[in-house]
C-alpha cells in the first residue's frame, strides 16, 4: 500500500532571464528512492539515480543545475518555460509518486511565489 | 569506488591568492555536482557553494562570493577552487565533495595557512 | 539563512549504550537532513541523507529521523569507534548550513 505524499513548490511564477527552484518532497513511507525524474509536459528534463548521479536532458544541458537536494534548478528562463513539471520519484517497494509543479514565466518584474499544497 | 584526491598544503602570505584542486576518480565526473566546504575551529562547517561539472553552472553562498572562485575540467575530472586576497580568517581545511541527491562523499581536505 | 542547532556541543556515553544526538532547523527543511561523523584529523563522513536513509556501507545501528525541524541521529550498541563528532546538516535551500556539531565521549 502506498502511503506516502508529495508536496510540491505548488503554482509558481518567476521573471523572464530569472532562476527558479522546482521541488519536491516525498514524506509519510520508509520506501526507498531509487530515482527522481522531472519532465516538463513529456519532455525529460533531468534524471536522479541512486547509483549513477545525474542526467541532464541535452536540450535543457546549458541551463539546468542539480539542487538542492532532488530538486532542479532551472536558469535563463524564457516565456516558453512556462507550464507543467512533474517530479517522478520511482521508490521500492511502492511504486511511483508523482508530483506536479505550475510556472508561469512573466515579462513584467513583478513575480510572485504561490502557496505550496500537497499531492497525495 | 568513488574517490577524491585533494592537493598538498599550502603556506600562503597575505593579500594572495591559492588555487586548490580536487581530482575525482571512480565514477562519472559530468554527473555528479562538486561541493567546497570550509572548516574552522571557531566557524565550524561552511558550505562555500557548488559547481555542477556538466554544464559548469556555479551556486555560491553569499558570504563567499568575491572571495571562491569554482571552476571544474571535465578532461581530468578535476574540480579546482580559487580563493583570493586570503586574510588570517582564510586559514582553515578546505574539503570537497561529491553530491548527487542521494548522499555525499568527502575528499581528505586541503590545509590553507596564511602568514603575514 | 537557515540555522541548524546541535545544542549539546559534548556527550558522554559507554560502550553498549545508545546515545540520541539532536538537531533543530530554525525553518521547515522538509526531509533535506544529512548526518556526519567526523573523526579527529578526518573528513567528514556521510551517515544519514534524507533524515533516515543510511549511506552505504554504515552499520546498522546508526538511525536517523526526523523531518520538518527536529531530526535526530540515534546510536545504538555504541563502539569506541564512535569516539567522533558528529554534524548535522541542511540541504533544502541554499546556502547549505551546518549544525555546530556534538562531540561524542566514550567513558
Known amino acids: 500500500m502506498m502511503t506516502g505524499t508529495i508536496e510540491t513548490t505548488g503554482n509558481i511564477s518567476a521573471e523572464k532571464g530569472g532562476s527558479i527552484i522546482l521541488q519536491c518532497h516525498l514524506s509519510s513511507t520508509t520506501a526507498q528512492v531509487t530515482q527522481v525524474n522531472w519532465e516538463q509536459q513529456d519532455q525529460l528534463l533531468a534524471i536522479c539515480n541512486a547509483d549513477l548521479g545525474w542526467h541532464i536532458s541535452p536540450s535543457f544541458k546549458d541551463r539546468v543545475a542539480p539542487g538542492p537536494g532532488l530538486g532542479l534548478t532551472l536558469q535563463s528562463l524564457t516565456v516558453n518555460d512556462t507550464g507543467e513539471y512533474f517530479c517522478i520519484y520511482h521508490t521500492y517497494p511502492d511504486g511511483t509518486y508523482t508530483g506536479r509543479i505550475f510556472l508561469e514565466v512573466l515579462e513584467s518584474s513583478v513575480a510572485e511565489h504561490g502557496a505550496r499544497f500537497q499531492i497525495p | 569506488q568513488a574517490y577524491l584526491q585533494q592537493s598538498g598544503a599550502e603556506l600562503v602570505r597575505s593579500g594572495a591568492s591559492v588555487k586548490m584542486s580536487c581530482k575525482a576518480s571512480g565514477y562519472t565526473f559530468t554527473s555528479y555536482s562538486m561541493h567546497w566546504v570550509k572548516q574552522t575551529p571557531g566557524q565550524g562547517l561552511e558550505w562555500i557553494g557548488c559547481i555542477y561539472p556538466g554544464n559548469v553552472i556555479t551556486n555560491y553562498n553569499q558570504k563567499f562570493k568575491g572571495k571562491a572562485t569554482l571552476t571544474a575540467d571535465t578532461s581530468s575530472s578535476t574540480a579546482y577552487m580559487q580563493i583570493s586576497s586570503l586574510t588570517s580568517e582564510d586559514s582553515a581545511v578546505y574539503f570537497c565533495?561529491?553530491?548527487?541527491?542521494?548522499?555525499?562523499?568527502w575528499g581528505q581536505g586541503t590545509l590553507v595557512t596564511v602568514s603575514a | 539563512d537557515i540555522v541548524m542547532t546541535q545544542s549539546q556541543k559534548f556527550m558522554s556515553t559507554s560502550v553498549g549504550d545508545r546515545v540520541s544526538v539532536t538537531c533543530k532547523a530554525s525553518q521547515n527543511v522538509h526531509t533535506n537532513v544529512a548526518w556526519y561523523q567526523q573523526k579527529p584529523g578526518q573528513s567528514p563522513k556521510t551517515l544519514i541523507y534524507s533524515a533516515s536513509y543510511r549511506y552505504s556501507g554504515v552499520p546498522d545501528r546508526f538511525t536517523g529521523s526526523g523531518s520538518g525541524t527536529d531530526f535526530t541521529l540515534t546510536i545504538s550498541n555504541v563502539q569506541s569507534e564512535d569516539l567522533a563528532e558528529y554534524f548535522c546538516?541542511?540541504?533544502?535551500?541554499?546556502?547549505?548550513?551546518f549544525g555546530g556539531g556534538t562531540k561524542l565521549e566514550i567513558k
Open positions: 546538516q541542511q540541504y533544502n535551500s541554499y546556502p547549505y548550513t
Open positions: 565533495a561529491r553530491d548527487g541527491g542521494f548522499g555525499t562523499y
